[in-house]
Each structure stands twice: as structure tokens, then as C-alpha cells.
């Protein structure tokens, strides 16, 4: 009953003489375990005897014995995990036919048939290509062989035009109940050059020998492959020649459909054949030519052909690196004269006159001078002739004003306060002078260009310079004005002593002045309007307080005289001329107030007083006034005072105070 049995295997197994077969097989039986397994070769059912007959290749019994098996046949099955796999090694051509798997369980019987196809020679693998091969697009080539057996080592090897392809092919094998195969997969990026080439998949044995092979011719779709040819085969032609370019399509798959020509990347109109003819070429036809050919895969562009049309130099023009050029700068002259081939010789002209020793396209004047100004032109020459000389280019050489000088217009001598006129002159200039500059800068009048009027000239306007200016300023040498003026900066200066003046010191005063023009001067000293001396110094051998006062000195020259500020001479001395005065007289009644005042002459003033009696006893009073209140008869006697400043001390003569009794005292007596 077929419903009780489920057996899985590949159905047909392929092999060749001397190889082996490996038959993957699994089974399931519904009612219990497999008890007997017999492998028949081409079994036939005998109706009479109700049993299968044929060559028994293998037989297993309950206890697992193999009573009469061939050694080359192995049952690799296992009743426990329902495996019925078997192998035949080696396998022979006469093993072809049906393998009958007779399976018997306790209650059921089944005959499963497996086809075995053993060829005399190894059969070829099959190459499987993708439907479309396109250049540079990676594809996978598959080589499939319906064979695999654990006991027989094989290899699949790829070749291109008979040479092994050493890209890494991935080989896989399958020995499952679904399928038995060996497969090699090769990743391959076909190039256009592979089109029409033969790819072979070889089946190799363990020693690498070819057992069989499959071949395919590659149909690689690719854009047209082009080369370009020029007739005559020179790409350098002369103006007026004719040139033919041919676009050769070396390969195209599929066939090309359109042709176009390009010059410098721009399509040429109405040029759509493989041949391009240029009649009587002109200079403008110089350029890079290529053809573009398209097929269904896409467009392809040939290599570029650089067509050079030769012609004599064209009328020249001169390019000057800078004009106007500044004197002293570097100027480059370039002769521009389109020509092919490039000119080999140049002739230069300055104001129509040939410049000797200059034969290059470019020349340089490192330091340009005014005389280099003018018109420059050139002629270019190549193998085809001498070009026309162009109109030339003007070189303007600019420079600062030259030989700038300054002139004093008014008569000399110049006195402080005069009006002075100066003019600024120059010899030449390019461009013209447009303004002047003066130094020092002052609020001075410029009545006309290049003339300066200085009104009320200052004593210190010693030198003036002018510049004549265009784009640059050129300065004249400064002119000394030699302004005459009365002495200036007159002042009294104490020379000695260095510190403060004390009575009795030797004192010197100096009459200083800062400047005078002319230099010859006279000095005068005065005190309180009285003339003291005519030297630059005023000397005191021993100064006295009476010499103190306000001093001035005068300095004069031929232009005028100048006085110093009044200078105060201060003499310091110790207290002198001390005396004691009594406001109420020398005689005072007892009980009244007696006031004694210490008067003195001192510089600086007295800062401390002391009082003494007739016994030279110091009294406890330190002020300028000594008040005795109430005065007593005992106070009668002589008194004196002492004054102190920082210079020294002085004391008064004695003064006598007489205190008499009051009437009351006399009455009491």
C-alpha cells in the first residue's frame, strides 16, 4: 500500500564508468520499523511466484547481516533514523538501469525504483549564462554537473580561450534527497574584447585531467570600439590643404546605428558618415576632432585627433605689461602674432627703428627710462613667411618732477615779522605737475601755483622746503631763510650759591637768553630802575639784607632789546635789631598790667622767643609779648628778650621796668 510508505531520493542518479554513485535516501513507514532491505538491479515482478526477481546487489536481514553483498555496494542507511542512503564504488556502465529498493516491515512491503544512468565517458557539465552580457557589468557564470560522490574527487575549472581563469570560483556540491550536483559559480566582468571568445568549463579528476567540458561563445553587448585614421597620415597640414578622417568601428555589438563628428567637443553639422573630409582647411579648423558612434548599448567616442592647420604669422600687435610705466620699473614687451607653427624669429621696432639684439617673442627692460617712451611694434616670422607689422603700441614713461629748486623772491636780510615770497621750480615732469607741497606746513598763502607767501614771518622759520608733485612729489633742497630777530628767552638765573642766600654769602646772578640773530648782544642789569652793570653776570662778594629786592636784566642786539621778568633776590639773616618796648612806659603802678614786646628784624621771621630777667634768669614765657598782670613792686628790674629763626639767634639790650606802690599801699603804710 503506497500510502503507508514515503521514500525520498533524487529519482535519477548520473555517473560514468569507474566513478561512483551516492544515492541519498530517506524513508518513512507508518506501521513500525523496517525489517528487511534488499537492493535489486533491474527487478521484475514474478506474478506466479508473487515476488520480485533480479540481481540482488545488497541484502540486509533483521540482525543486520549481509549474506551475499557485493563489496562495491554499501548500504549506508540506518533503521533508527530512517536513512536508506547507499553507494556503489566503482560504478560500471552495466549498472545502468533501475535500482530496486525492496523494503519490508512487519505488515507492509514496498518496492522503490531509482534510475541509474552510467555513461561510458564522463558526461559534460552545462554552462549557464545570464540572458544578457554587457561590458563591465559583473555577472555570474554557472557550470552545473549532475554528479557528486563522496568517493570520487572532481573539480570544475573555467577557461577563457583555453587559458585558465584565475578569478575565485565558488564550488558547491549537493548530495540531498532533492538533488545531486556539483556547481561552480564564477563572478565575471566581461569586456568588449571577450565578445565572440570561448568560455569553457572543464570537468577535472583528482589529478587535474580533463574528463569532459562544455563550451559557450560569449555574446558581450558593448558600445562601438573606435579608432580614427587621418589621410594623409599627418595631422599637421597647411592652410588650403584637404584632410580626410576615417572613423573605424573595430567592434560593435549590436551593430552601430548613428555616427557624428565633433570638433573641440562641439558636434559638426551634417557630418554623419564614417568619413569626414575637410576641403581647403583654414586656421579656424585647427582643433581636436573625434567621432561618436552609437548602438543600442550607448554612444562611444573615439580618441581625439589634433588637427593643426599651419599658416604664416598674422598682423602683429604688441602687448606692454604696463603703460604708462613708472621710471625705474620693469617693463615686458610681448609680440602677439598668431601663427602655426609658432614663429621662430621676431624683429622689434622702437619709433620705427629696429631694436638691435632683440629676436624673441618677449623682451624686457629692467629699468625703464624716460627716453624708452614711444611706439613699439614687431614682426613675426615662421617657416611659412614673415607676418605684417602691426600699428604698434605706445609706451608712456612717467616720472616724478626733475631738478626741483626753490628761490627766495624778496630782498635780504629778512627780519622777524616781514612778508616773504618763495617760488618752487622744476625742469621736467610726466605727467604735468598738479600741485605743490611745502614744509613746514603753515597757514600760509599760495597766491599762485608754485608760489608761497609767508606774512609776518616768525623768528623760528629757519628753513623751508618745497615739492613739485604729479603722481609723485620731488622735494627741493631746503632753503635757509636766515630770519633776524631780537634776543629771545631772556631770564635771570642764580648761579651761586646753589642753595638759599644767607646774609654774607657770595652771590652771582646770570643773565641768560635762548637765542639771538644776530648773535652779537649787550647786557644791562637794573634794580628798582637803577642801572647796576653791563656784564652777563651780576656778582655780590658779601650779600647784605639791604641787597634784597627785584632785579631785571636786558639783552639787546642790532634788531632790538629784550628784558627778563623781574627776579626777586631774597637774603636770609638771623634776628637783628632786637629791642623790648613797653606800651605803658617804663614805670608802672603795682596792680596794673605791664606789657613788654620783643621787636625784631629777621628773615625768615622769628619763630621762637625767650625772656630773661636782670639775673639772666629765663622767664616762663615764650611769646613775643610778656604780660605781667597784676604787676608787683618785686617785678621791678631790667629785662631782655631773645629771638630765634632757622638762621640763628639775636637778643635785645636790657630795658628797666620800675613798679611803684599804689596810693593804697602807701596809705596803709
Amino acid at each position: 500500500d503506497s500510502s503507508k510508505w514515503n521514500i525520498e531520493h533524487p529519482g535519477t542518479i548520473y555517473a560514468w564508468e569507474g566513478a561512483c554513485v551516492w544515492v541519498p535516501c530517506t524513508y518513512r513507514v507508518l506501521d513500525g520499523a523496517l525489517e528487511t532491505f534488499i537492493l535489486f538491479h533491474n527487478p521484475e515482478y514474478n506474478q506466479n511466484m508473487s515476488k520480485f526477481e533480479g540481481t540482488r546487489l545488497y541484502e540486509s536481514t533483521k540482525d543486520g547481516k549481509v549474506p551475499s553483498g557485493q563489496k562495491r555496494v554499501q548500504f549506508l542507511g540506518n533503521k533508527i533514523n530512517n536513512n536508506c542512503t547507499l553507494s556503489i564504488h566503482p560504478v560500471h556502465v552495466n549498472d545502468s538501469g533501475q535500482l530496486g529498493l525492496r523494503m519490508v516491515s512487519k505488515t507492509e512491503k514496498w518496492m522503490e525504483r531509482i534510475h541509474l544512468n552510467v555513461s561510458e565517458r564522463p558526461f559534460p557539465p552545462r554552462i549557464q549564462l545570464p540572458p544578457k552580457l554587457q561590458e563591465s557589468q559583473e555577472v555570474t557564470l554557472t557550470c552545473l554537473l549532475n554528479f557528486s560522490c563522496y568517493g570520487y574527487q572532481i573539480q570544475l575549472q573555467w577557461l577563457l580561450e583555453g587559458v585558465p581563469m584565475r578569478q575565485a570560483a565558488v564550488t558547491s556540491t549537493s548530495l540531498s534527497t532533492k538533488s545531486v550536483f556539483t556547481r561552480s559559480e564564477l563572478k565575471f566582468s566581461p569586456q568588449w574584447s571577450h565578445h565572440g571568445k570561448i568560455v569553457t568549463c572543464e570537468l577535472h579528476d583528482v589529478d587535474g585531467k580533463v574528463l569532459s567540458e562544455d563550451m559557450v561563445q560569449l555574446n558581450v553587448k558593448h558600445t562601438p570600439k573606435l579608432t580614427i585614421e587621418v589621410t594623409p597620415n599627418e595631422t599637421i597640414v597647411r592652410k588650403g590643404d584637404s584632410v580626410t578622417m576615417t572613423c573605424k568601428v573595430n567592434s560593435s555589438n549590436p551593430e552601430y546605428t548613428t555616427v557624428s563628428w565633433l570638433k573641440d567637443g562641439i558636434p559638426l553639422k551634417e557630418q554623419n558618415t564614417l568619413m569626414l573630409t575637410l576641403h581647403e582647411v583654414t586656421k579656424s579648423q585647427t582643433g581636436r576632432y573625434c567621432c561618436r558612434v552609437s548602438n543600442d548599448v550607448g554612444p562611444a567616442t573615439s580618441e581625439k585627433v589634433f588637427l593643426q592647420v599651419q599658416y604664416a604669422p598674422e598682423p602683429s600687435r604688441v602687448q606692454i605689461s604696463q603703460s604708462p610705466a613708472v621710471e625705474g620699473s620693469e617693463v615686458n614687451f610681448l609680440c602677439i602674432s598668431p601663427a602655426n607653427p609658432l614663429p621662430t624669429n621676431y624683429t622689434w621696432y622702437h619709433n620705427g627703428k629696429e631694436v638691435q639684439g632683440r629676436t624673441e617673442k618677449q623682451f624686457q627692460i629692467q629699468k625703464i627710462l624716460p627716453w624708452h617712451a614711444g611706439t613699439y611694434s614687431c614682426e613675426a616670422e615662421n617657416i611659412l613667411g614673415i607676418g605684417e607689422r602691426g600699428p604698434g603700441t605706445e609706451l608712456d614713461v612717467q616720472y616724478p618732477p626733475k631738478k626741483v629748486t626753490m628761490v627766495i623772491e624778496n630782498p635780504t636780510p629778512i627780519r622777524e615779522g616781514d612778508t616773504v615770497t618763495l617760488s618752487c621750480n622744476y625742469s621736467s615732469s610726466n605727467p604735468i605737475v598738479n600741485h605743490y607741497e611745502w614744509r613746514p606746513r603753515g597757514a600760509w598763502e599760495e597766491p599762485s601755483l608754485g608760489v608761497l607767501k609767508i606774512q609776518n614771518i616768525g623768528w623760528n622759520n629757519t628753513a623751508v622746503a618745497c615739492a613739485a608733485c604729479n603722481n609723485w612729489c620731488s622735494w627741493a633742497s631746503p632753503v635757509t631763510l636766515n630770519v633776524l630777530y631780537a634776543p629771545r628767552g631772556v631770564r635771570v638765573r642764580k648761579i651761586k650759591p646753589l642753595s638759599e642766600i644767607h646774609s654774607g654769602n657770595s652771590v652771582s646772578l646770570q643773565c641768560d637768553f635762548s637765542s639771538s640773530h644776530p648773535k652779537e648782544v649787550q647786557f644791562f642789569w637794573e634794580k628798582n630802575g637803577s642801572l647796576l652793570g653791563k656784564e652777563s653776570q651780576l656778582n655780590f662778594d658779601s650779600i647784605s639784607p639791604e641787597d634784597a629786592g627785584s632785579y631785571s636784566c636786558w639783552v639787546n642786539n642790532s634788531i632790538g632789546q629784550t628784558a627778563s621778568k623781574a627776579w626777586t633776590l631774597e637774603v636770609l639773616y638771623a634776628p637783628r635789631r632786637l629791642r623790648v618796648s613797653m606800651s605803658q612806659g617804663n614805670q608802672v603802678m603795682e596792680g596794673k598790667t605791664a606789657t613788654l614786646t620783643c621787636e625784631s628784624d629777621a628773615n625768615p621771621p622769628v619763630y621762637s622767643y625767650a625772656w630773661f630777667d636782670w639775673n639772666n634768669q629765663s622767664l616762663p614765657y615764650s611769646g613775643r609779648m610778656l604780660r605781667l598782670e597784676p604787676v608787683k613792686v618785686q617785678h621791678s628790674g631790667a629785662y631782655w628778650c631773645q629771638g630765634t629763626n632757622r638762621v640763628g639767634k639775636g637778643h635785645s639790650p636790657l630795658i628797666t621796668l620800675t613798679v611803684y606802690y599804689s596810693p593804697q599801699t602807701i596809705g596803709r603804710r
Epitope: P164, V206, G208
Partner: antibody, heavy 119, light 112 residues
Framework: QVQLQQPGAELVKPGASVKLSCKTS????????MQWVKQRPGRGLEWIGR????????HYNENFTTKVTLTVDETSNTAYMHLSGLTSEDSAVYYC????????????WGQGTSVTVSS | DVVLTQTPLSLPVSLGDQASISCRSS???????????LHWYLQKPGQSPKLLIY???NRFSGVPDRFSGSGSGTDFTLKISRVEAEDLGAYFC?????????FGGGTKLEIK
Amino acid sequence: QVQLQQPGAELVKPGASVKLSCKTSGYTFTIYWMQWVKQRPGRGLEWIGRIDPHSGDTHYNENFTTKVTLTVDETSNTAYMHLSGLTSEDSAVYYCARRDYSYYVLDYWGQGTSVTVSS
Amino acid sequence: DVVLTQTPLSLPVSLGDQASISCRSSQSLVHINGDTYLHWYLQKPGQSPKLLIYTVFNRFSGVPDRFSGSGSGTDFTLKISRVEAEDLGAYFCSQSTHVPYTFGGGTKLEIK
């Protein structure tokens, strides 16, 4: 042109090892299997084994499996044969030879290296 | 392993003579792919073997046409139509049908 260069001679002590080289030029090294052959006077030629330089796959004559190790260095296009546990029986001339991939014939041979095992 | 028996062991010849060397195999050298991998080499003294004939009858590049090979299955022959001085040396047959490859014992071609 195809060339296989081998050193002229090696002198080694018994029990030691030696590594013979075979430097190739003039062809694509990885396409052709390299074979090694031993020749002793009066004993003819013996095939030792082969190596596929592309895969490094080797196959040895059973008589040499414990004696020989074949290797290649693709970067220098050089094949090597390592002989170990040398005895006087290993004294011989050893040739490397390229095997053609179409007819499985040894078409180009090296000049051979003479190995002498002596104490 | 396949045994190749070469006869004669030594072959004395005169220059200009024909020479013939036989090589017999212990089993068929026809590979399953149909090709027979029997080859002939010449080894001159102090040199390495040089290929003469491959797969029974194909002459290797540069080999003069006085050398020819024949045979099938297990019996093979190398013939030299007119021996020249440069042909002297030891000739070996070799098979690469079965692994391991094997060589005949050699035949020494020498002047009489």
C-alpha cells in the same frame, strides 16, 4: 622564455632538514602545477608529488608523504620542497618540473639540486 | 603503481642508423577521457630530462622530425630515423594517466 632555476647543490647532515627552491619566470606561475622528481644513480626517476600554485592544493606519492612538504610563494613565483629527517637514502638530485595544463606532461624542468646527506 | 618496462637497457648504434626503444605498461594508459598520457624524455649527462614526445606521438616544440612515437594501450615505441651525435643519452618513457606518475628505467643510446 620559460625558466625554472634551482640551486646547484646542498650538503646536509643526517637527521637535519633542507628546503629546496625553484624560482620560475617566463610564464604565469599560478596556471601550471609544479611537480617534483627524484633521481638517484642507477635508480631511475621517481615522482614525489605536485602542488597547484593557485590553490596550494598538494598531492604526494605515498612513498614520500612523511618526508616531503610542498609550498609556493606566489609573490616571488617560487616553489619550495621541504625534506625532513634526512638519511643517506635521500641523497639524490631533485628536479622541479612544470606540468602542462592541457597534456599533463612535464614540459619544462629545472637544472636540479644535488642533495648530499653526510656527517 | 603503474610499472613501465623499457627495452633495451642499452642501445649501441652507428650515426645515421635507425633506433627503436620499447616501453610496456603494467596496465592500460588510456584515461577515462580517452587520451593516453605516455611521454618520452631524453636526458644527456649532467643535464635535466628534456621533453621529446607527449601523449604517445606529439613532438614537443623544437624537436626534430626524426623522432616519432607510436603505440596504444600498454605498448609504446620511440623511433629515431637517423641517429645524430646530439641524440646520445638516456631515454625515459613516463606515464601521467595514473597517480603516482611513473617513469621507465631508461635506455642508454650509445655509439657502437
